[in-house]
């Protein structure tokens, strides 16, 4: 004979557990139905009546099958430096994601609580470590023989051009200036960028001491409220 299908609520066999989407109610000592995502338990089960579920109210949610007496509150609205990548519905919490050009300074289980603008390295400093989702850019002073003349979240220090005859020697924030005769090695105009988030160009290669011969026209997107153009002392 096939086993009888028990309908909730029912008393489980000793040593057995309730089925999927059921829970054991300690008070009723019965297996009872859980409420579906988007609902909560309005009335708990008894020995003779099953769980009564009700829809979550506006701005509240339940993501899982549950028997909670109240739905969870959705997180606060996203700030201007964030994007709502997942809306608050009866079945899911709101998720806020930092806009391009920002990183997550204070994470939540899902999304970000607090965003901060990516640091921009000032002239004389280059990017030592690029920014990520949850970490800021790290700047470093340009070593002798290299320079950066930009305020940027992506530019690394690049070598001075080598001149046959130097008109003005280069320093950390300026390239060498050659006399009218061609330099031995002509450096490309524009900045060298890390193959990194936050650059608007996407075909970057790993940075090398030598820039490519093609000029770069990368720029940092002014996403949302513009991050302050912070100088950095490389800390």
């Amino acid at each position: 004979l096939p086993a009888q299908v028990a309908f909730t609520p029912y008393a489980p066999e000793p040593g057995s557990t309730c089925r999927l989407r059921e829970y054991y109610d300690q008070t009723a000592q019965m297996c009872c139905s859980k409420c579906s995502p988007g609902q909560h338990a309005k009335v708990f089960c008894t020995k003779t009546s099953d769980t009564v579920c009700d829809s979550c109210e506006d701005s509240t949610y339940t993501q899982l099958w549950n028997w909670v007496p109240e739905c969870l509150s959705c997180g606060s609205r996203c700030s201007s430096d964030q994007v709502e990548t997942q809306a608050c519905t009866r079945e899911q919490n709101r998720i806020c994601t930092c806009r391009p050009g920002w990183y997550c300074a204070l994470s939540k289980q899902e999304g970000c609580r607090l965003c901060a603008p990516l640091r921009k390295c000032r002239p004389g400093f280059g990017v030592a470590r690029p920014g990520t989702e949850t970490s800021d850019v790290v700047c470093k002073p340009c070593a002798p023989g290299t320079f950066s003349n930009t305020t940027s979240s992506t530019d690394i220090c690049r070598p001075h051009q080598i001149c046959n005859v130097v008109a003005i020697p280069g320093n950390a924030s300026m390239d060498a200036v050659c006399t009218s005769t061609s330099p031995t090695r002509s450096m490309a105009p524009g900045a060298v960028h890390l193959p990194q988030p936050v650059s608007t160009r996407s075909q970057h290669t790993q940075p090398t001491p030598e820039p490519s011969t093609a000029p770069s026209t990368s720029f940092l997107l002014p996403m949302g409220p513009s991050p302050p153009a912070e100088g950095s002392t490389g800390d």
Partner: nanobody, 118 residues
Framework: EVQLVESGGGLVQAGGSLRLSCAAS????????MGWFRQAPGKDSEFVAA????????NYADSVKGRFTISRDNAKNTGYLEMNSLKVEDTAVYYC???????????WGQGTQVTVSS
């Protein structure tokens, strides 16, 4: 690292349609959430649409709801923005962006120009 390249922009008359593509390389695109942003001359960038990295759910700016559709093809490592009933005010450079875990859009492309004429 993820590199993103947008395409499909162009000049279209009001009421027309365009389909933007965002080709990703360098990492498994399916692991990333994807969003589209746009920036009109002299204006701050504006969020357009997003697709969740874990459950594929989508979210749209009010200004494009019902007209734009975001989607992705993980096999082709490409995301899309289908734009219908275009309006003059949709004119902007459109950027796709990627987020590894939904905390920040830490990668984006160079953008593609969309111009809607009356």
């Amino acid at each position: 690292e993820v590199q993103l390249v947008e395409s499909g922009g162009g000049l279209v008359q009001a009421g027309g349609s365009l389909r933007l593509s965002c080709a990703a390389s360098g990492r498994t695109f399916s692991d990333y959430g994807m969003g589209w942003f746009r920036q009109a001359p002299g204006k701050d960038s504006e969020f357009v649409a997003a697709i969740n990295w874990s459950n594929g759910r989508t979210n749209y700016a009010d200004s494009v709801k019902g007209r734009f559709t975001i989607s992705r093809d993980n096999a082709k490592n490409t995301g899309y923005l289908e734009m219908n009933s275009l309006k003059v005010e949709d004119t902007a450079v459109y950027y796709c962006a990627a987020t590894p875990s939904g905390k920040a859009y830490s990668y984006w492309g160079q953008g593609t120009q969309v111009t809607v004429s009356s």
